[in-house]
């Protein structure tokens, strides 16, 4: 094995090099030192390095890791938060322009039921908005909501229109007797099970998003341990400290620093590959009563039906829910 | 029949978030999405590789550093850590991740969790028409979960239909509705993906 | 060391196929993906589809989807690449690239195959 | 497709000068663009990608910038084994496209 050169006389080169790190010459010797006091650059003659540089250069090792990593994650960082970007946008805009295709529907085939109308379709499409993006509402309780509120105007303005409009009586019997006489027929539980289901996996796919992001992020602002900066300081810099600036570390023991540095980092990759798979069959999924965009866009339709189911029977419920709401409505006319 | 909103279905404007080609539909965006997160697939195993093949290692000269001496890149001597007796590589394996890494990898078991949970069952809902049509209360049997609803052509045929829309720099407003009755079905142009 | 090692030239008459293959090595197979590219005379290069060892996947440019079908052995971690149908237009050299880990770029490549359609 | 133009098509240069090539996609490509030296007779080999991030093992003479539709890509202080075709390759949509080359030679 060649011995290695003696270091340089003067510690010139060192301090040069140095100088790019650190700008103040102060802290390396001028020739080569004992360099007892060091700690990870141990010295089997004389070194010129002294204990403050050895520090700056395990300082500098982990900045280098840490950049490495950041250069390393940046593709997929961005891919990950340019596409939850791009779907929470999307989604807001599906949910805007069902809301608009619905009120559309009203305005040109029930005039009569606007505004009242808009404001419940409105009520409506905000739960959605806020449910996607993660509020604990309950989606068969919005569009119950939606129903509930929907009917005593249909009542009031299409079945039985020379009822007054302002009692709250009749409104709150109106209100019960929807689902007890399940006046809109299957309706209400059919929108609830599209609703539900395509809304719960657009907010775990947005969910899953997030997360993604939240994993690069962490691995790109990892501090590592003392020992690992120990470790990359000698394998970059400590042969600085014999005046070798030229010479570049063995491959495979920066294969096995590396494994050492990085171990817990990764631990991840079992629960990363599976993330990916499960994100990639949960989208495999996302199509029918499961895709939030086939079923918004084409709700308009189904609460047109419902109503037409309503107007259908409007007979027959006029009847059942004078006797219901007999009482209310007396009270009413007083 | 229902009115369909034609002229709200995008109105020449083509809803374009982050400048995606106007033809392109979520699915698809999606599909594009799984396509390129899969080639990140091993991401954490090359890391070590990654940051080696990025710093200053020898690969042409015959001598390298090992951590403590200059020795022949091919020799024993070159793999080993220089100076074993300082600190051990193997304890500080042992040590177990970082708190911060334990935490994100419970998150991902978490979500990992949910997303199992929460994907379709295959064959679930496949081979049936989307458009379905003549709808009555009732049809749909005890499981709703294979009804589109709507009836005749008041049913809107939606597969992805929204087309990404071009920054949006007006909100669509129910008052710019005309009144015709036109009925659309917008084409569903998917790029082709995966074929397995 | 990452290598991908393609077979040899070949010359084959108007009509049947060919199947050119692409060895692999100096990393995990099944966690990349595999391109094919193709580069006519004087021509720049096209990109022909791709394979996903993981599980199977392929993604074709539609140009190519009735003219190349795309095949993997994992136990030699070798893709295949077969062109049906061969005319003139399919004289090329074609090229297996490896994609992903810390991009969706095509990262390394073969040294190509030449492939020559003539009667 | 995303369509990429790529341009000039050929170029001469002096040793130790500096030579930038230019690629325009027919939209915007979220600066999914990688820059390839294409050898005779050997496979291409990636030089930049996602913009500006160099391989490994390539030296700092090259470099890549851009975004949105536009993007180049600039060698500096040319040495002889610079000599080759350059491609510019778009990858954000999944149909990816190649510029049409840029054949750099020396004066």
């Known amino acids: 094995q060649p011995p290695p050169p003696p270091p340089d006389a003067t510690c010139h080169q060192v301090r040069s090099f140095f100088q790019r790190l650190q700008p103040g010459l102060k802290w390396v010797p001028e020739t080569p030192v004992p360099g007892s006091d060091l700690q990870v650059c141990l010295p089997k003659g004389p070194t010129c390095c002294s204990r403050k540089m050895e520090e700056k250069y395990q300082l500098t090792a982990r900045l280098n890791m840490e950049q490495l990593l950041q250069s390393a994650s940046m593709e997929l960082k961005f891919l990950i938060i340019q596409n939850a970007a791009v779907f929470q946008e999307a989604f807001e805009i599906v949910v805007r322009h069902a809301k608009n295709y619905t009120n559309a529907m009203f305005k040109n085939n029930y005039p009569s039921l606007t505004p009242q109308a808009f404001e419940f379709v409105g009520e409506f499409f905000t739960d959605v908005s806020l449910y996607i993006l993660g509020s604990d509402i309950n989606v068969d309780d919005m569009v119950n909501e939606l129903f509930d509120s929907l009917f005593p105007v249909i009542y009031t303005q299409l079945m039985n229109p020379g009822l007054p409009d302002s009692a709250l009586d009749i409104n709150e019997c109106l209100r019960g007797a929807r689902r007890d006489l399940k006046v809109f027929g299957n309706f209400p539980k059919l929108i609830m099970t599209q609703v539900s289901k395509s809304l719960q996996v657009t907010r775990i796919f947005l969910q899953a998003l997030n997360l993604g992001i939240e994993v690069i992020n962490t691995t790109d602002h990892l501090k590592f341990s003392k020992d690992c900066g120990r470790m990359l300081t000698r394998m970059w810099y400590c042969s600085y400290c014999q005046g070798l600036m030229m010479v570049k570390p063995c491959g495979g023991y920066c294969n096995v620093v590396m494994q050492g540095c990085m171990a817990g980092v990764v631990e991840i990759d079992k629960y990363w590959r599976e993330y990916i798979l499960s994100l990639e069959e949960l989208v495999n999924g996302m199509y029918r009563i499961y895709d939030m965009e086939n079923v918004l866009l084409g709700l308009f339709s189904t609460i047109h039906d419902s109503i037409q189911y309503v107007q259908k029977n409007a007979g027959k419920l006029t009847t059942t829910i004078g006797k219901l709401c007999a009482h209310s409505q007396q009270r009413q006319y007083r | 029949s229902a009115y369909y909103p034609e002229d709200l279905f995008i109105d020449k404007k083509v809803l374009k978030v982050a400048h995606v080609e106007h033809e392109e539909t979520l699915s698809s965006r999606r599909r594009e999405l799984i396509q390129k997160l899969k080639s990140f697939i091993s991401f954490y195993s090359a890391l070590p590789g990654y940051i080696c093949s990025h710093s200053p290692v020898a690969e042409n000269d015959t001598l390298c550093w090992n951590g403590q001496e200059l020795v022949e890149r091919y020799s024993q001597k070159a793999a080993r850590n220089g100076m074993k007796n300082q600190f051990n590589l193997h304890e500080l394996k042992m040590k177990g991740p970082e708190p911060v890494v334990s935490q994100i990898i419970d998150k991902l078991k978490h979500i990992n969790q949910l997303l199992r949970t929460m994907s379709v069952p295959k064959g679930r809902v496949l081979d049936k028409n989307l458009d379905e049509e003549g709808f009555e209360s009732g049809d749909c049997g005890d499981d709703e979960d294979e009804c589109i609803g709507g009836s005749g052509d008041g049913m809107m045929k939606v597969k992805n239909q929204l087309r990404f829309l071009a920054e949006l720099a007006y909100d669509l407003d129910v008052d710019d509705v005309p009144g015709n009755n036109q009925q659309a079905t917008p084409k569903d142009n998917e790029i082709s993906t995966f074929h397995n | 060391e990452v290598q991908l090692q393609q077979s040899g030239p070949v010359m084959v008459k108007p009509g049947p196929s060919v199947k050119i293959s692409c060895q692999t090595s100096?990393?995990?197979?099944?966690?990349?993906?595999i391109h094919w590219v193709k580069q006519s005379h004087g021509k720049s290069l096209e990109w022909i589809g791709l394979?996903?060892?993981?599980?199977?996947?392929?993604n074709y440019n539609q140009k190519f989807k009735d003219k190349a079908t795309l095949t993997l052995d994992t136990s030699s971690s070798t893709a295949y690449m077969e062109l049906n149908s061969l005319t003139s237009e399919d004289s090329a050299v074609y090229y297996c690239?490896?994609?992903?880990?810390?991009?969706?770029?095509?990262?390394?490549w073969g040294q190509g195959t030449s492939v020559t359609v003539s009667s | 497709d995303i369509q990429m133009t790529q341009s000039p098509s050929s170029l001469s240069a002096s040793l130790g000068g500096k030579v930038t090539i230019t690629c325009k996609a027919s939209?915007?490509?979220?600066?999914?663009i990688a820059w390839y030296q294409h050898k005779p007779g050997k496979g291409p080999r990636l030089l930049i990608h996602?913009?500006?991030t160099l391989q490994p093992g390539i030296p700092s003479r090259f470099s890549g910038s851009g975004s949105g539709r536009d993007y180049s890509f600039s060698i500096s202080n040319l040495e002889p084994e610079d000599i080759a075709t350059y491609y510019c390759?778009?990858?954000?949509?999944?149909?990816?496209?190649f510029g049409a080359g840029t054949k750099l030679e020396l004066k």
């Open positions: 100096g990393f995990t197979f099944t966690d990349y993906y």
């Open positions: 996602f913009t500006s």
């Open positions: 394979v996903f060892p993981y599980d199977g996947g392929t």
């Open positions: 939209q915007d490509i979220n600066n999914y």
């Open positions: 390759l778009q990858y954000d949509n999944l149909l990816l496209t």
């Open positions: 690239a490896r994609a992903g880990g810390f991009s969706y770029a095509l990262n390394y």
